[in-house]
């Protein structure tokens, strides 16, 4: 059974999310469960470090993009949100909070501002931003 969920403030169009927890979960209350991942969008604006702390306080991390297939709902995300991707100036690479390196061809990185943090935007785009800039953020929790 699939539920047609239309969340105007989160997605650009209708997103199909399973109704019953037997397909996915468990997740914290009111979080979105999709293909063995739990997601929550937070409307309050925080800088990257505060966003990271907020996710950690809920036993989660900032959004990690690891698969266009498993995370296809991210294609439709509205606006821009902090994700857990940071630039490592010493070697020029981009890595996730868990230390893993950004896989090639997973995100299109666009240098909009000077900074070492990245905002997630629809269609798997990452916009470089100043880490101290307040913005909304996405927390994520793996269910398996």
């Amino acid at each position: 059974i699939w539920s047609a969920v239309f969340l105007n403030s989160l997605f650009n169009q209708e997103v199909q999310i399973p109704l019953t927890e037997s397909y996915c979960g468990p997740c914290p209350k009111n979080w979105i469960c999709y293909k063995n991942n739990c997601y929550q969008f937070f409307d309050e604006s925080k800088n990257w470090y505060e966003s990271q702390a907020s996710c950690m306080s809920q036993n989660a991390s900032l959004l990690k993009v690891y698969s266009k297939e498993d995370q296809d709902l991210l294609k439709l995300v509205k606006s821009y949100h902090w994700m857990g991707l940071v630039h490592i100036p010493t070697n020029g690479s981009w890595q996730w909070e868990d230390g893993s390196i950004l896989s090639p061809n997973l995100l299109t990185i666009i240098e909009m501002q000077k900074g070492d943090c990245a905002l997630y935007a629809s269609s798997f785009k990452g916009y470089i931003e100043n880490c101290s800039t307040p913005n909304t953020y996405i927390c994520m929790q793996r269910t398996v």
Partner: antibody, heavy 121, light 109 residues
Amino acid sequence: QVQLVQSGGVVVQPGGSLRLSCAASGFTFDDYTMHWVRQAPGKGLEWVSGISWNSNKIGYADSVRGRFTISRDNAKNSLFLQMNSLRAEDTALYYCAKDLSAMLSWGIDYWGQGTLVTVSS
Amino acid sequence: SSELTQDPAVSVALGQTVRITCQGDSLRSYYASWYQQKPGQAPVLVIYGKNNRPSGIPDRFSGSSSGNTASLTITEAQAEDEADYYCNSRDSSGNHDMVFGGGTKLTVL
């Protein structure tokens, strides 16, 4: 194509009020930050105010803070600027403008044709 | 609030390279956007972000940044490049606010 159509020019007395409007088309209005930018005759560009896609973030230039109010109606694809306590130095061409970003200020990629506001007795 | 400073006027010989600069504290944290404005017309975005050009903007326009200075470079300047050029960036307060430079009048000789 992107269009930002603004209301016509007007003359208003010092101390008076005025509401500017801007009708947007050709893009998803509620995906972007919008701004008002003004240009006094023969002068440079001055940012006046900006508002994020969901109205959560609003900013004003020091010169207009407390007198001007920006707002938007996403259902009607419209941007507004309520101008109160107008002064002679507010005389300018006012541009409605679209940002590259939804929440932040990344730069303006489209501009309206401008509305000339003249504050004079 | 921040201030961005531009030279009021710059000239360049036809076909030569010219650099227009913009200085301000906010440019240590943020990239500048650049706009071209011709008399009686609305401004046109020519550079944004690190060095991004909107579609339709010739590749002779490029942007760069170092410290508190942003630069717009026009290589092989054409007669139609004669215009006023404005830089702008986010205010150094980190809020939603923006700030514009005073503008540079470019004359192509």
